[in-house]
């Protein structure tokens, strides 16, 4: 039975040209996290973090995506095209798969505020 819960940073905004941390956290389960995948709104992979083999960054994003902190992902040099949904997929044993959603809005304004609160989707 899947008892876990994914908490995410929810809806966040950040300034064009700046950076943002995408963060998910799996709680309420003793399952072993074997891999975390980070995907964009069109379900294309940004990065994979395998528990044993480490981070794998999609080549097209290697200059704009930094691993971490932790199982999270840092997006840098943000453009307006980065606006949209991001998904963290936790592959676990024995529970199976957990998925969290984050919505990122990239703003032109210099007053863009990066909210770092965690919420349960």
């Amino acid at each position: 039975m899947m008892t876990g819960t994914i908490e995410t940073t929810g809806n966040i905004s950040a300034k064009k040209g700046g950076s943002v941390i995408l963060q998910c956290h799996l709680s309420s389960t003793m399952a072993q996290v074997t891999q975390v995948n980070w995907e964009q709104h069109d379900h294309s992979l940004l990065a994979i973090r395998n528990a044993e083999l480490g981070w794998h960054i999609y080549p097209a994003f290697k200059d704009r995506v930094a691993p971490g902190p932790g199982l999270g992902l840092t997006l840098q040099s943000l453009t307006m095209n980065d606006t949209g949904e991001y998904f963290c997929t936790y592959h676990t044993y024995p529970d199976g798969t957990y998925r969290g959603r984050i919505f990122l809005e990239v703003l032109e304004s210099s007053v863009a505020e990066h909210s770092a609160r965690f919420q349960i989707p």
Epitope: N37, L45, I48, E52, G54, H56, I57, P59, T97
Partner: antibody
Framework: DVQLVESGGGLVQPGGSLKLSCAAS????????MSWVRQTPDRRLELVAT????????YYPDSVKGRFTISRDNARNTLYLQMSSLKSEDTAMYYC?????????????WGQGTTLTVSS | DIVLTQSHKFMSTSLGDRVSITCKAS??????VAWYQQKPGQSPKLLIY???SRHTGVPDRFTGSRSGPDYTLTISSVQAEDLALYYC?????????FGGGTKLEIK
């Protein structure tokens, strides 16, 4: 040049045990996760064990869980696979493999393999 | 576990021909697919990763592509040294799994 050299294969009876070794050179062994991949006589490939760079995290598929143990000695640049309660279906060529660089998704370095035969 | 199906165990081709080796995933694996080549008596060699990224030193006649759950390794003009076994592998979900292999042979 990266080199992975497996050893320790042989003929074992069902229920027996064996320990394979993989000597690594040409890269900073302690910085990389490592895997064992086997190839059965019908040429199928199966990932059987993976370990992180410091040995603190391991992964096994259900087919070998509880019977195989992966470990490493970073001081000796050596990867190990301890196999017990061996079955005829464990008969295979065993390769150690790794990948370098965070862009690579897959195994870009493989050893030459060592053969395990489980038979009475 | 995710199953990768290489429906052709053998493929016959002529030197200079264009050939496409296919791999179908049982569920979405996005771009987390690699292709390997294995020649007789050798260990597998990485050709393609992230579905379409060519590994260092791999000739540009090898191309990887994706259409939904179907992944294709294309050799634009088959050379004698390309006659080998080809495997796909997914890394989207643990355990990472391999296809059953396709053996490329000369007609």
């Amino acid at each position: 040049d990266v080199q992975l050299v497996e050893s320790g294969g042989g003929l074992v009876q069902p229920g027996g045990s064996l320990k394979l070794s993989c000597a690594a050179s040409g890269f900073t062994f302690s910085s990389y996760g490592m895997s064992w991949v086997r190839q059965t006589p019908d040429r199928r490939l199966e990932l059987v064990a993976t370990i992180n760079n410091n040995g603190g995290s391991t992964y096994y598929p259900d087919s070998v869980k509880g019977r195989f143990t992966i470990s490493r000695d970073n001081a000796r640049n050596t990867l190990y696979l301890q196999m017990s309660s061996l079955k005829s279906e464990d008969t295979a060529m065993y390769y150690c493999a790794t990948r370098t660089g965070t862009e690579i998704l897959g195994f870009d370095f493989w050893g030459q393999g060592t053969t395990l035969t489980v038979s009475s | 576990d995710i199953v990768l199906t290489q429906s052709h165990k053998f493929m016959s081709t002529s030197l200079g021909d264009r050939v496409s080796i296919t791999c179908k995933a049982s569920q979405d694996v996005s771009t987390a697919v690699a292709w390997y080549q294995q020649k007789p008596g050798q260990s597998p060699k990485l050709l393609i990763y992230w579905a379409s990224s060519r590994h260092t030193g791999v000739p540009d006649r090898f191309t990887g592509s994706r259409s939904g759950p179907d992944y294709t390794l294309t050799i634009s003009s088959v050379q004698a040294e390309d006659l080998a076994l080809y495997y796909c592998q997914q890394q989207y979900s643990t355990p990472w799994t391999f296809g059953g292999g396709t053996k490329l042979e000369i007609k």
